[in-house]
């Protein structure tokens, strides 16, 4: 009869353990089951901001190719102009070729007419070599008309269809360059 | 709050090198650019190096070719590489990040001196 009770005993226990392993089981399911819907939460959130911001360029930016381009309302020195893109994530235009610039002017022409706008384009005090902001040199087609007579820096701007060069202190509009975003589709 | 934290400045004789380092962090938003700026005695704060967060990267004339800037996103870290330095690389240079809210934060500065 002791052991009748003993082998029951010993069921039960083994029960009461397979019982407490599929709540275990159970937690185990149930926490990677929150995990994967808090992921598929994040990651639709993620595809619907993604879906919202995927225009390649931000409003009221002009897109050629892999670039966009920002034409100012406003007028600024040269080094504040430097700022102003940056504040927008972008740098002052970087003319690479004579395509890039017959686009700049052709966009400007139907937008504002024949004004002056800053580029990333100064000439060194000492050397006087023009360079991009970056440190590249301009391309031979992509120099400055005319050098300016100043004794203060010297910086490249944008009128109808030629590059020249002034003051970088003087006032104009400026152009911001940042790079598209490349469509997922 | 957002802090920013930087390092690496010191006394380097002409010629020689040093490399500067900014960490963000905090309750910064996006970051769209990330520059470093310097202040001489008696002169105004000047942009030296700028990068974006696509990677496009502005410089002064007086540092194209002997400084370099570049960043780790993931970090939100930006490093100035100063070669070649001269005594008018004398400053405090300062840290300063545009954050895609629009807010703009500086650093407290370092200073880097350029002297046999």
């Known amino acids: 009869k002791l052991l009748q009770v003993s082998t029951i005993a010993m069921q039960q226990q083994e029960k009461l353990i397979q019982q407490e392993r599929a709540l275990l089981n159970f937690t185990e399911w149930k926490r990677s089951c929150a995990l994967q819907m808090k992921y598929c939460q994040a990651f639709m959130q993620n595809s619907l901001s993604s879906a919202h911001n995927s225009s390649p360029c931000p409003n009221n930016w002009i897109q050629n190719r892999e670039s966009c381009y920002y034409v100012s309302e406003i007028w600024s020195i040269w080094h504040t102009s430097q700022e102003n893109c940056l504040k927008e994530g972008s740098t002052l235009l970087q003319i690479e070729s004579k395509e890039e610039m017959d686009f700049i002017t052709g966009s400007l022409r139907k937008i504002k007419g024949s004004y002056d706008y800053w580029v990333g384009l100064s000439q060194d005090g000492h050397s006087g070599r023009w360079l991009w902001q970056d440190g590249s040199s301009p391309s031979p087609g992509l120099l400055p008309a005319e050098r300016s007579q100043s004794a203060n820096q010297v910086c490249g701007y944008v009128k109808s269809n030629s590059l020249l060069s002034s003051n970088c202190s003087t006032w104009k509009y400026f152009i911001c360059e940042k790079y598209a975003l490349r469509s997922s589709v | 709050q957002v802090q920013l934290q930087e390092s690496g400045g010191g006394l380097v004789q002409p010629g020689g090198s040093l490399r500067l380092s900014c960490a963000a962090s905090?309750?910064?938003?996006?970051?769209?650019?990330m520059g470093w700026y310097r202040q001489a005695p008696g002169k105004q704060r000047e942009l030296v190096a700028a990068?974006?967060?696509?990677?496009?990267?502005t410089y002064a004339d007086s540092v194209k070719g002997r400084f370099t800037i570049s960043r780790d996103g993931a970090k939100n870290t930006v490093y100035l590489q100063m070669n070649s330095l001269k005594p008018e690389d004398t400053a405090v240079y300062y840290c300063?990040?545009?954050?895609?809210?629009?807010?703009?934060?500086w650093g407290k500065g370092t200073q880097v001196t350029v002297s046999s």
């Open positions: 905090g309750s910064i938003s996006s970051i769209n650019a």
């Open positions: 300063k990040v545009f954050a895609a809210d629009g807010m703009e934060y």
């Open positions: 990068i974006t967060g696509q990677g496009r990267t």
